[in-house]
């Protein structure tokens, strides 16, 4: 159940896809990845106010309990709902390999 | 890739399954759920320090970028990796129904 996409905190403040450019050095991959040398990492960042992009029933419960017990129960969290694949050309013991990662770049976000 | 389960912050401080007792009133369900009157909600709570229970490559990247840019990139977040089903007996227009919810109770946690 994909709940309200209206952000009550103001435009761009709630859970959404952001792009962060990162070098292989930033990621700690410089020694074993050949290409690309930099990645446009898409990730899910932002607040999850009441029922905003609630992923499922669990997220709805979490919102209710966070309201009641904010010190015990955290608010839902902005995480990937799906991913885009990415190919890395990487060094191996025997040479090089092409590895497709299906869980590297966020495609869509929700709150859970 | 389920990374290290050792919590560097001390026992019980990192991402793990917690149980929170909640009444139908707490959950806002009193008007439409007949049974149970109380739910033992299992949810994922706790910190996600470097590589602790990293769900996938995305979580590993997030950790690296959070270290570099803590104001821009949040740390990974503790969320359900899987769920346990739960049956609710609920009121309907015509009487009652048994509804199984597959996404209500967290079964296992990871960081993403």
């Amino acid at each position: 159940a994909r709940n309200g996409d209206h952000c009550p905190l103001g435009p761009g403040r709630c859970c959404r896809l952001h792009t962060v450019r990162a070098s292989l050095e930033d990621l700690g991959w410089a020694d074993w990845v050949l290409s690309p040398r930099e990645v446009q990492v898409t990730m899910c960042i932002g607040a999850c106010p009441s029922q905003f992009r609630a992923a499922n029933m669990h997220a709805q419960i979490k919102t209710s309990l966070h309201r009641l017990k904010p010190d015990t129960v955290p608010a839902p969290c902005c995480v990937p709902a799906s991913y885009n694949p990415m190919v890395l050309i990487q060094k191996t013991d025997t040479g090089v390999s092409l590895q497709t990662y299906d869980d590297l770049l966020a495609k869509d976000c929700h709150c859970i | 890739a389920r990374n290290g389960d050792h919590c560097p912050l001390g026992p019980g401080r990192c991402c793990r399954l917690h149980t929170v007792r909640a009444s139908l009133e707490d959950l806002g369900w009193a008007d439409w759920v007949l049974s149970p009157r109380e739910v033992q909600v299992t949810m994922c709570i706790g910190a996600c320090p470097s590589q602790f229970r990293a769900a996938n490559m995305h979580a590993q990247i997030k950790t690296s970028l959070h270290r570099l840019k803590p104001d821009t990139v949040p740390a990974p977040c503790c969320v359900p990796a899987s769920y346990n089903p739960m049956v609710l007996i609920q009121k309907t227009d015509t009487g009652v129904s048994l509804q199984t919810y597959d996404d209500l109770l967290a079964k296992d946690c990871h960081c993403i």
Partner: antibody, heavy 119, light 107 residues
């Protein structure tokens, strides 16, 4: 200003080997991969392979494995491609080309080196 | 290997016209595609990366679009400097193959 300056045209005999150089300037040499591309008479372009000057890793188009060897000299910021056991099929213009850091294009190209294999 | 099928192979058009060149990949390449222009006797020049991103200094009359297996390069209001050959190239798994090229000639 980014520049890739390739060595001059070559006329070589069948069976011989030769090395083309590509001198890079105007950017951090180890920060970008260097690719090599073959353009045969007419128009078709073929990707030969790439070298990562930072970690020395190479990847080749299977078609050119054993035909081309890619190396770099970091101190002189120069990339090299050695072509082995040349035949008339290897007559072409060869380009070095810098790969963008995101790995989805080649943004600067050398002027090309014409290789003619003939007895 | 992924095959890149480019069409048309050649095109004869007048200055001021609009043209669209297409490239079809034999499998999904997730927008990992570049377009190049090459003039006779010169090196290729980058026009577009990542299917839609115009390279620095490329005039806005050029635009790239597409996703999945289908991509296109559009040139509106053709100018005389735009004549030459155009190539697409994918960057999804190696080898990074090129399309067969499209030769754009003045009518």
């Amino acid at each position: 200003e980014v520049q890739l300056q390739q060595s001059g045209p070559e006329l070589v005999k069948p069976g011989a080997s030769m090395k083309i150089s590509c001198k890079a300037s105007g950017y951090s040499f180890t920060g970008y991969n260097m690719n090599w591309v073959k353009q045969s008479q007419g128009k078709n372009l073929e990707w030969i392979g790439l070298i990562n000057p930072y970690n020395g890793g190479t990847i080749y188009n299977q078609k050119f494995k054993g035909k081309a060897t890619l190396t770099v000299d970091k101190s002189s910021t120069t990339a090299y491609m050695e072509l082995l056991s040349l035949t008339s099929e290897d007559s072409a213009v060869y380009y070095c080309a810098r790969e963008v850091r995101l790995g989805n294009a080649m943004d600067y190209w050398g002027q090309g080196t014409s290789v003619t294999v003939s007895s | 290997d992924i095959q890149m099928t480019q069409s048309p192979a050649s095109l004869s058009v007048s200055v001021g016209e609009t043209v669209t060149i297409t490239c079809r990949a034999s499998e999904n390449i997730y927008s990992n595609l570049a377009w190049y222009q090459q003039k006779q006797g010169k090196s290729p020049q980058l026009l577009v990366s990542a299917a839609t991103n115009l390279a620095d200094g490329v005039p806005s009359r050029f635009s790239g679009s597409g996703s999945g297996t289908q991509y296109s390069l559009k040139i509106i209001s053709l100018q005389s400097v735009d004549f030459g050959s155009y190539y697409c190239q994918h960057f999804w798994g190696t080898p990074w193959t090129f399309g067969g090229g499209t030769k754009l000639e003045i009518k």
